[in-house]
Amino acid sequence: GITIPRNPGCPNSEDKNFPRTVMVNLNIHNRNTNTNPKRSSDYYNRSTSPWNLHRNEDPERYPSVIWEAKCRHLGCINADGNVDYHMNSVPIQQEILVLRREPPHCPNSFRLEKILVSVGCTCVTPIVHHVA
Amino acid sequence: GITIPRNPGCPNSEDKNFPRTVMVNLNIHNRNTNTNPKRSSDYYNRSTSPWNLHRNEDPERYPSVIWEAKCRHLGCINADGNVDYHMNSVPIQQEILVLRREPPHCPNSFRLEKILVSVGCTCVTPIVHHVA
């Protein structure tokens, strides 16, 4: 069979765990962007489905701080500034990748993990179930 | 500051690039979740600030497919189903981590990268600038 040309600068793959365990360069591209959503926009306050941002911190994870959105109301804010319960505030969720130290306390050994986070809230028309 | 005790089973970190280059186990936790947001919820259609989901695919990145939200309207949908331009549909953005093969053709070498993605849209009260 054809063999793919291997880059001569590749790290060694004789590790018995290869290819599950790989080398990852943590010198992140675009890492100087602002990760605190409160500083990057005030949508969480101005939205008709406003949310609070909760700091989720885990020193054994990278990134160690993740901001989680929690909708302030079950309903949405109407034009009068009151909560309208004919509409629903719901969290918009996204799966993200994080690195978790494994084994714990190892400075240079991680495991890839997918977690579901709430990024913000949106106002939706409810699904009404009619009882027969 | 407190120093975390080092786990005796940690891999060797004598690499001159340490701690920028780390070992990562890619056997992902929670990997059986659904990554297509269209299948996981219909908020994108039911929201007062509805959005379309665009497929952003990059064959050299993990995850290779990321769904990007684009707000359908500048305004928001009112109770009559019309677009109300006194309100604004805005994207909720989040920074996520992705892995990129680097250098190319190395089966076990990656670089961590941060990218900004739009996850969904929310309806906000506009900021009105009064001209003096």
Epitope: G1, P19 | L26, E60, S64
Partner: antibody
């Protein structure tokens, strides 16, 4: 050495469901960055991409056929499956599976193909 | 989807000559990451396709240097210097920059 081999029923009648199997060796779908695609080729015609499955069970389909396609895998048996519902004479073709790896190119290894004839 | 149009449909050549195959896409296939995922495959009679060129101009492992790819945006070319008997078959271009992925209709390289 990477090898892939397709198997299927050979002949089907219209409206039946086609079940194809791709058996492979030399790589694992438990490995990060590995995937398998299905591509078909009607006799004497060009190639059409059908579907793809990644090691983490992410699946993608050609939108033109998506409603009829189902791709799945059994990584422990080194097999990938493709089902096509409600076949028609237009589905008469040679079906190939190919390996894809997360990286700069797409289909680096292909199977020999399995031929399907849809006839009443 | 992106339509890939190959010309000519058939290309008669003499052994030792140069062959040139054109592939045109209905829209730019430059990916948002800056790369162009344009590939060339050769399908010899009775065989499955084999990857020759990826990302417009990179030769895949084991592919002789008489094969070269070039082009950008929407226009791409595969050149074969000094055609040998083993090069005969149908050549397909393929784009992986935009979903769904699409192949060209093929160009048959045959002996003049």
């Amino acid at each position: 050495q990477v090898t892939l081999k397709e198997s299927g029923p050979g002949i089907l009648q219209p409206s039946q469901t086609l079940s194809l199997t791709c058996s492979f060796s030399g790589f694992s779908l438990n490995t990060f960055g590995m995937g398998v695609d299905w591509i078909r080729q009607p006799s004497g015609k060009g190639l059409e991409w059908l579907a793809h499955i990644w090691w983490d069970d992410d699946k993608y389909y050609n939108p033109a056929l998506e409603s009829r396609l189902t791709i799945s895998k059994d990584a422990s048996k080194n097999q990938v499956f493709l089902k096509i519902a409600n076949v028609d004479t237009a589905d008469t073709a040679t079906y190939y599976c190919s390996r894809r790896e997360l990286g700069p190119y797409f289909f680096d290894y292909w199977g020999q193909g399995t031929t399907l004839t849809v006839s009443s | 989807g992106v339509l890939m149009t190959q010309t000519p449909l058939s290309l008669p050549v003499s052994l030792g000559d140069q062959a040139s195959i054109s592939c045109r896409s209905s829209q730019s296939i430059v990916h948002s990451n800056g790369n162009t995922y344009l590939e060339w495959y050769l399908q010899k009679p009775g065989q499955s396709p084999k990857l020759l060129i990826y990302k417009v101009s990179n030769r895949f492992s084991g592919v002789p240097d008489r094969f070269s790819g070039s082009g950008s945006g929407t226009d791409f070319t595969l050149k074969i210097n000094r055609v040998e008997a083993e090069d005969l078959g149908v050549y397909y271009c393929f784009q992986g920059s935009h979903f769904p992925y699409t192949f060209g209709g093929g160009t048959k390289l045959e002996i003049d």
